[in-house]
Structures are given as C-alpha cells and as structure tokens.
Interface confidence: medium
C-alpha cells in the first residue's frame, strides 16, 4: 500500500540495509525509492537531543512483511519508499540547503558568482554529484565565493555537517538541465579499457546501458554477450569511469559491446524500465516465491505486483500438467540484477515493471501505429491536443502537445487576437472533432506564456506554453511526449510525423478525424534555398517532400512534429509556417524544440 506522509518522532526498528547521509527526510525518501531493496527508512534530523554525528543519517531498511515495528524517538523521521506507489517519481532535486556542508571528494575548486552558478557548474561536470558553495559572508576571506564540486561512490554525501554561511545542493543532471553531450550509440565489437567501478549481470547491452545510466559513478560501460569466448564473463556488464569522463582506449574485440551513460539525457529514455522478455534464459537470484502462472506475461504481472520482486524466470508447463500453468519464480538480489544468467534451459525471464514509473512518463511505449492511410486511430498520438476558442463561437483554433501534467506546448502565433486564457479550452484524448459536445470534459487554461522574443511566425520564436487549470491524469489516450535532449545533437531523426485536424489543401476546412503524414526532415541549408526571402535560422527546422503533396496546413499550427528514436517519441518541432500547403519545393517550417528546452524548463519548473 502507498504511504506518502512522513512519520515525525518515529523510528523503524531493525531491517537495516545501509546508512547514507541526506540533507532532508524528503531526499532520504527519494534515495530509498531508487535503492533496489529499500522499502522503509528512518532519517535523523538535527536536534539538540541527538548526537551530532547522527544528524542527517538516512537508514535504508527492508522487511519481508513490508513494515517494521515503530519506536518513538525525538528528531527521527520515518517513512516508506515510493516503490509502493503508482505515481510518477523523479530524482530531480533543486533544493538548496543553507548552512549545510555536504562532504565528499572535493575534486574541483573554483570561484563562482553565486550558488546558482556553482550548481550549473556541477550540472555540466561529468563527475559532479553535489556541491558546496561558500557565500560572500563566509568568515574565511580566501574561501569566499568558492564553489567546491564533489563526488562519492554512492552519489550521496559521506557526511553532512552544519557550517555557517555555506550552501549545498545537488547536480541537476536528473532534471534534464545538463549541457554534457549524449552519445547514444552502442558500439559493437568494442571494449573500453578503463577502470571498472562495478560489475553486474545483464541479459543484453541495452539493459547494461540503462544500469550504467542510473549508477552514480558509471560514465560508460562494456558488455560481454552470451557468445563471448570466456564463459565466466558471459553476460557481464562492466561499469566504468575515467578522469576525463571518456574512454581512453577503444579495443576491437568480437562479441563485446560498449556504450555510454545517458545521464544527461535520461529524461527522454527509459532507464529503469526493462520491459523485454528473454527467451531460453534463466535469471538466478534469491527466491522470493514460486507461483503458478499461465504465461510469462502473467508471471511478469505477478512480479510487478510483488513489491520486493525485482526479476523473474518463468518455466512453461509440461504438456497437460497443472492446468497448463507453468512455474513463475519471483526473485531478488542485493543490487536488483540477476546474480547469474544461464541460457539453454528453456526458461523465459524478465524484470519487474514496478520501476517504470521512475522513468519519465513520456518514454512509455504506445500502441503500434497503423501503417499507411492518413487518418489516425485512437491512442496513436496521445500527446496531441485540440485547442479551442469559445469566442465568438466555439471552434478548433490550433494543435498542441502534452509535455507535462499541467503543460501544453504550442505555437505563439495561435494567440493573435486572444485577449484572455478564459476563452480557451484544451481537449485531450480526442480523435474526431465531432466527439466534442457541450458536456465533453476539457482543461481550462490558467496562463498563456508566449516567448518574449516572438514577433511573427516567420521570424522565429514561434513557441508558447499553456498552463492548465487542472492536471492531466495520464492514460493510454492522453500522455506526454518527450522533449529532445540538449546533449542529443547527434541524433538523426528518420521517422517523423506531422499530425493535426488542419486543412487537407489550402482552401478547405478543419478535418473531423485527426490526420497524420510521415514527412522527412530537410536540412536548413536546403530549406533556406526554398525560402530565399526569409531567414531560416537554427531555431527552425524544416520538413517536407521535394515534390510536395504531404504537409501541415492551416489549423495544424501549434501541433507536433513527432519523431521516433530508439522506441521513444520526441517532440522535434512545432508546426509554425510555410508557403502555401504541400507545395512543390516548399517544405513546412517548424519551431526547432531542442533550441528552446532551456526556455521550456525555466518556465515549467519555476517555483
């Protein structure tokens, strides 16, 4: 059961796994949630009645019964992990802790104008987990305005002490705010020869890469496949680091694969959600339970519903035994990964899906799309919304995209002549405009945020945010799309679609059914040749066929140019402008979303 509130002056007795230091009980709860085994925790706040060496300790605990005896203790704050909850969880922590010194390895010291600059430096440094900044009121003159970047093996401080006139905080890499470059490629037949900081067992290089991404010290990895010549190293995932943050050497070796931590673009990739099944593969680990199940899918459900289960192996039923039910072995380990992986025994293995909620909701796989045709089907583009105006009469105004549970991203030019957000209605989960009746539920708009450099669509900055009055509950028919990552400049998108209820030709009317068209991206250089009278800037992106025929048109404005990469959909563009519709050698021009990620995050994450 999900318990979110913290229990003041309460200590859980026993069940200790490990002790870490955190600046607050709230952050202790996050650490517990991300730990593979932690279900409960006890945090000790600063208090005159408590030994200062125990201040800020966060004791992570586990229990077979999912609870522990409670004892009264002043300054103790206890609670439960969010693993038991169904809501979205984020490791992003923007809090600044005043008069606290978070101890770690101080590997970089420099002068900074402010704590914010120090935090930015930490976010853009590959090794940095947290920082301490000495303010200009700090007693020691030579240490004033000094920004100390720190790291530890666990990503959390080794100790926290009170220290006047300093502030501390964490890297904002997990808030999608890092400028570090993302290298998404997995390199076949390659071994990176640098220090190993840890090793785990993984069924494939993709799982190995995800484990590296959420491991605090891992910067890149090498994975030995099941065909690797040395048997004892098969399925071994080596988590690695180096001083420069990059591999010093690439060695060509068959049956090995290597790649990078995607820490700085983790908001747009699944990190915790290993949803694949591994056939003819057995995962070994501590056995939690053995239950009968009809299929490997049913076994995965059982594992997901058992809070302590981390992975499973399903052995299909032998002929007519046990009403056709096989055995479902629910398992766990100290680090969440199998202790050994065996092949050729006929088992089907996989992981719990309980941790999927720790990934950004936008990374969830959506239903397979219908190939061919121009009309969409329900749930095909769950981030697409229709924005209506009610003045003078109600009508479809523009498209938009859900990017957060209270945020729609659209085009600034949609709001020409819109005096107030009160006349706007956002409808989500809609396929046909005819579904919208008087009593159809909608989201009111609390605020329209237009980019302050916007003048007209053709000169750029054609981007706006709508803050909704109420939050969107995510379902299969309404869920967010991922923003592209700032560090992801090497991605070449080849599977891009424009969607909307707009005109099918220049003189037409709004369509009833949501239309879709697959459209190739065009280089800005090529686009500029087609629009000699305009300036195509890097803040714009173009898409279209040379021969025309498929394009966005009037009424599609503000809607998404959605591109799929590695099974995840990204909002690459916002429909902005073009010469006519679907004309030969006149591509559509879209707002290049990656160039506005900072602006979007600044507006949507403002406290």
């Amino acid at each position: 059961e999900c318990v979110t509130q913290l229990l003041k002056d309460t200590c859980f007795e026993g069940g200790d796994i490990t002790t870490v230091f955190t600046p607050s009980a709230k952050y202790c709860q996050v650490v517990c949630t991300y730990h593979p085994r932690c279900l409960l925790f006890t945090f000790t706040a600063e208090s005159p009645s408590e030994d200062p060496t125990r201040w800020f300790t966060c004791v992570l605990k586990d229990s077979v019964t999912e609870t522990l005896p409670r004892v009264n203790r002043t300054a103790a704050i206890s609670g439960y992990s969010f693993k038991q909850c169904s809501h979205q969880i984020s490791a992003c922590n923007k809090d600044i802790y005043v008069d606290l010194d978070m101890k770690g390895i101080n590997y970089n010291s420099s002068v900074a104008k402010s704590a914010q600059e120090c935090q930015e430096r930490c976010t853009d440094d590959v090794h940095c987990h947290f920082f301490t900044y000495a303010t200009r009121q700090f007693p020691s003159l030579e240490h004033r305005n000094i920004c100390l970047l720190k790291h530890t093996q666990t990503g959390t401080p080794t100790r926290i002490t009170k220290l006047d006139k300093v502030v501390s905080g964490f890297s904002l890499k997990s808030c999608a705010l890092s400028n570090l470059a993302c290298i998404r490629d997995i390199f076949p037949n390659t071994v990176f020869a640098d220090s190993n900081i840890d090793s785990v067992m993984a069924p494939d290089a993709f799982v190995c890469g995800r484990i590296c991404t959420h491991h605090p010290g891992c910067l890149f990895f090498t994975f030995f496949s099941q065909e690797w010549p040395k048997e004892s190293q098969r399925n071994l995932c080596l988590l690695k680091t180096s001083e420069s943050g990059l591999p010093s050497t690439r060695i060509k070796k068959s049956k090995a694969l290597s790649g990078f931590s995607l820490q700085s673009c983790r908001h747009s990739i699944p990190v915790f959600c290993h949803s694949s099944f591994y056939h003819d593969t057995d995962f070994l680990g501590e056995e939690l339970d053995i239950v009968a199940a009809k299929s490997h899918e049913a076994c995965q459900k059982l594992c997901t519903n058992a809070v302590r289960c981390q992975f499973f192996t399903y052995t299909p039923a032998q002929a007519s035994c046990n009403e056709g039910k096989g055995k479902c072995y629910l398992k766990l380990s100290s680090n969440g990964s199998p202790t050994k992986i065996l092949h050729g025994r006929g088992g089907i293995s996989g992981y719990t899906l309980r941790l999927c909620k720790m990934d950004n909701e936008c990374t969830t796989k959506i239903k397979p799309r219908i190939v061919g045709g121009t009309a969409s089907v329900r749930g095909e583009w769950p981030w697409q919304v229709t924005l209506h105006t009610t003045s003078p009469t109600q009508r479809h105004l523009c498209g938009g995209s859900i990017i957060g549970n209270q945020w729609i991203l659209t085009a600034a030019h949609c709001f020409y002549g819109v005096e107030s957000p009160k006349i706007l209605r956002v409808y989500s989960g809609i396929l046909n405009q005819s579904e919208i009746k008087e009593d159809t539920s909608f989201f009111g708009v609390q605020e329209i945020i237009i980019h302050d450099q916007y003048k007209m669509a053709e000169s750029g900055y054609d981007i706006a945010l709508l803050k909704l009055e109420t939050t969107v509950n995510y379902t299969d028919s309404q869920r967010p799309i991922c923003l592209p990552s700032k560090g992801d400049r090497n991605v070449i998108y080849t599977d891009c679609w424009v969607t909307g209820w707009g005109y099918r030709k220049l003189r037409d009317k709004i369509q009833n059914t949501l239309q879709k068209a697959k459209i190739p991206l065009v280089t800005n250089e090529e686009c500029q040749k087609r629009y000699r009278g305009h300036k195509i800037t890097h803040k714009m992106i173009c898409a279209g066929y040379r021969e025309g025929g498929k394009d966005a048109c009037k009424g599609d404005s503000g809607g998404p140019l959605s591109c799929k990469h590695n099974e995840v959909w990204h909002l690459v563009g916002i429909t902005s402008w073009g010469e006519g519709c679907a004309q030969r050698e006149r591509p559509g021009v879209y707002t290049n979303v990656v160039e506005y990620v900072d602006w979007i995050l600044e507006k949507t994450q403002a406290v």
């Epitope: 001083e243 990059l246 591999p247 050497t249 690439r250």
Partner: nanobody, 122 residues
Amino acid sequence: QVQLVESGGGSVQAGGSLRLSCAASGYTYSMGAMAWFRQAPGKGLEGVSLIATSSGFISYTDSVKGRFTISQDNSKNTVYLQMNSLRAEDTAVYYCAAGTQFSWSPGSYNYWGQGTLVTVSS
C-alpha cells in the same frame, strides 16, 4: 598549462569553404576533449563541434551537421574544422577550446585560443 593557437580564418563567399586549425602545446595529455565554439556579433558563445581526443568521438550542433567536419592529427597535436557550404550566418569569431569534459557548455573548457574571424558574405 596548455596553449591553443587557431589559424585559417578569413573572408569567403557564401557556399565557399575554409579550414580552421587549432594547434595545442604544453601539458596536452590532460585534455579529454577539444571543441570549436563561435561567437557571432552581438551574440553569446555557441558550441559548433566537439571531439574526444583519445577515443575520437565526435558531435556537431544541428546547424552545421553535414557541412562541417572536425578531425584531429594526434602526431601534431592539432584539431581541424573543415567548413564547407558556408552561409552568412556562419560569420563569427571561432574559438578553439580544450578541457576534460565532452560538453556543450563553454564553462567546461579550461583552455581557450585567441579566436579567428570567419566572414561569409552573401
């Protein structure tokens, strides 16, 4: 200390090419990455391309993809930026930078060249 010296800038017509060089000297084995940044008149610094010196990983910003190529000659401790199909908006002072991080953030680079001006006229 690391010293960086850029060369190869100049004036060129739109559609033309230039090749910038950045020669590094001094304590160069401390450099994990080298980058080209540019600053157009009245604008901030913009990352153009990155290269990881030991392993050769490369990254480009969207606006130069397919037109610019970064490369290195380890024997000469030199990094190059081959710029083809130049456009008026490529006009800027181009800086070579070296540091330990493979990053688009200028703050991640400890060593900078003096800059070389590239002017593209349409």
